[in-house]
Interface confidence: medium
């Protein structure tokens, strides 16, 4: 049975040129987790593997950076990046959970964070 | 059924170069990282190299470092081990065998190939 | 390359419970645990076990897989005679950034 939840950053906007740190931490399981998956849309942007580390999808080498922790960070912001982002946990024994976060990217500074939300 | 079958061994003299293949089916080889995992006759295992589904990490064991370098035709459902200034030492069955899957990071090390002889002799 | 620790050879009578076990350090099987792989002579190695408990399909459960600290052990429960084999445990070392095998263990069905 899945009892974990993710926790993530939840409704999010920054400004464009900026970055932003996309963030979900899963809780309440004691499951091991084997790798954190990081999509936008259906494109792989990133691989936390829990053996070999950070691997980064070449398309996005420039403007993503791991960390901190599982998280990943956003850089150079364009309103391209609005969007939908995806953490997905792989874990064993439970299985995959997947946290949401919404971006949305600004052209002037009134961006502001919204509230952290959980997923079942 | 995942099916993994090595080729390139046989005889060679020392600091002379071979190339083993392993030639991949029955699964999506360009998802799966990749091992070269070796066995001296009658010795244990001994990692070798382990690559990345997109070659874009890539590590070696410090016997071969330098020596050996480990690649990938994800077209040819394929993995290479160019192995350069062999040695005595480098005698054994290299064997493939599957890595990580990409979308889960499960089963390392979960199917094998049955391995190709490379012996290092004058 | 340092390799993980086991004992060179195991020797248990029909039906009873082997321990094998895997001693390594916090870098490798205390950081992520280890996989074990069984080997009959002449054929190529069979995963049994991944990060520590984790079978793979098809896996007999009369083996088991667990860590304590920097050692970890195998299980193998009322053992039969193709249980006689070589076993090897391995692990991710992330000082070495490589994969690290033990020696193997012979285990002997009597």
């Known amino acids: 049975m899945m009892t974990g939840t993710i926790e993530t950053t939840g409704n999010i906007s920054a400004e464009k040129g900026g970055s932003i740190i996309l963030q979900c931490h899963l809780s309440s399981t004691t499951a091991q987790v084997t790798q954190v998956n990081w999509e936008q849309q259906d494109q792989l942007l990133a691989i936390c593997n829990a053996d070999l580390g950070w691997h980064i999808s070449p398309s996005f080498k420039d403007r993503v950076a791991p960390g901190p922790g599982l998280g990943l960070t956003l850089q150079s912001l364009t309103v391209n990046d609005t969007g939908e982002y995806f953490c997905i946990y792989h874990t064993y024994p439970d299985g995959t959970y997947t946290g949401r976060i919404f971006l949305e990217v600004l052209e002037s500074s009134v961006a502001e964070h919204g509230a952290r939300f959980q997923i079942p | 059924q995942v099916q993994l079958v090595e080729s390139g061994g046989g005889v060679v003299q020392p600091g002379r170069s071979l190339r083993l293949s392993c030639a991949a089916s029955?699964?999506?080889?360009?998802?799966?990282?990749m091992h070269w995992v070796r066995q001296a006759p009658g010795k244990g295992l001994e990692w070798v190299a382990l690559?990345?589904?997109?070659?874009?990490?890539?590590y070696y064991a410090d016997s071969v470092k330098g020596r050996f370098t480990i690649s990938r035709d994800n077209s040819k459902n394929t993995l290479y081990l160019q192995m350069n200034s062999l040695r005595a030492e480098d005698t054994a069955v290299y064997f493939c065998?599957?890595?990580?899957?990409?979308?889960?990071?499960?089963?390392?090390?979960?199917?094998w190939g049955l391995g190709t002889l490379v012996t290092v002799s004058a | 390359q340092a390799g993980l620790t086991q004992p060179p050879s195991v020797s248990k009578g029909l039906r009873q419970t082997a321990t094998l076990t895997c001693t390594g350090n916090?870098?490798?099987?205390?950081?992520?645990?280890a996989a074990w792989l069984q080997q009959h002579q002449g054929h190529p190695p069979k995963l049994l076990s991944y990060r520590n408990n984790n079978r793979p399909s098809g896996i007999s459960e009369r083996l088991s897989a667990s860590r304590s600290g920097n050692t970890a052990s195998l299980t193998i429960t009322g053992l039969q005679p193709e249980d006689e084999a070589d076993y090897y445990c391995s692990a991710w070392d992330s000082s070495l950034s490589a994969w690290v095998f033990g020696g193997g263990t012979k285990l002997t069905v009597l």
């Open positions: 916090s870098n490798n099987v205390g950081n992520r645990g």
């Open positions: 065998a599957r890595g990580y899957d990409l979308l889960t990071g499960y089963y390392n090390f979960d199917f």
């Open positions: 690559i990345w589904f997109d070659e874009s990490n890539i």
């Open positions: 029955g699964f999506t080889f360009s998802s799966y990282g």
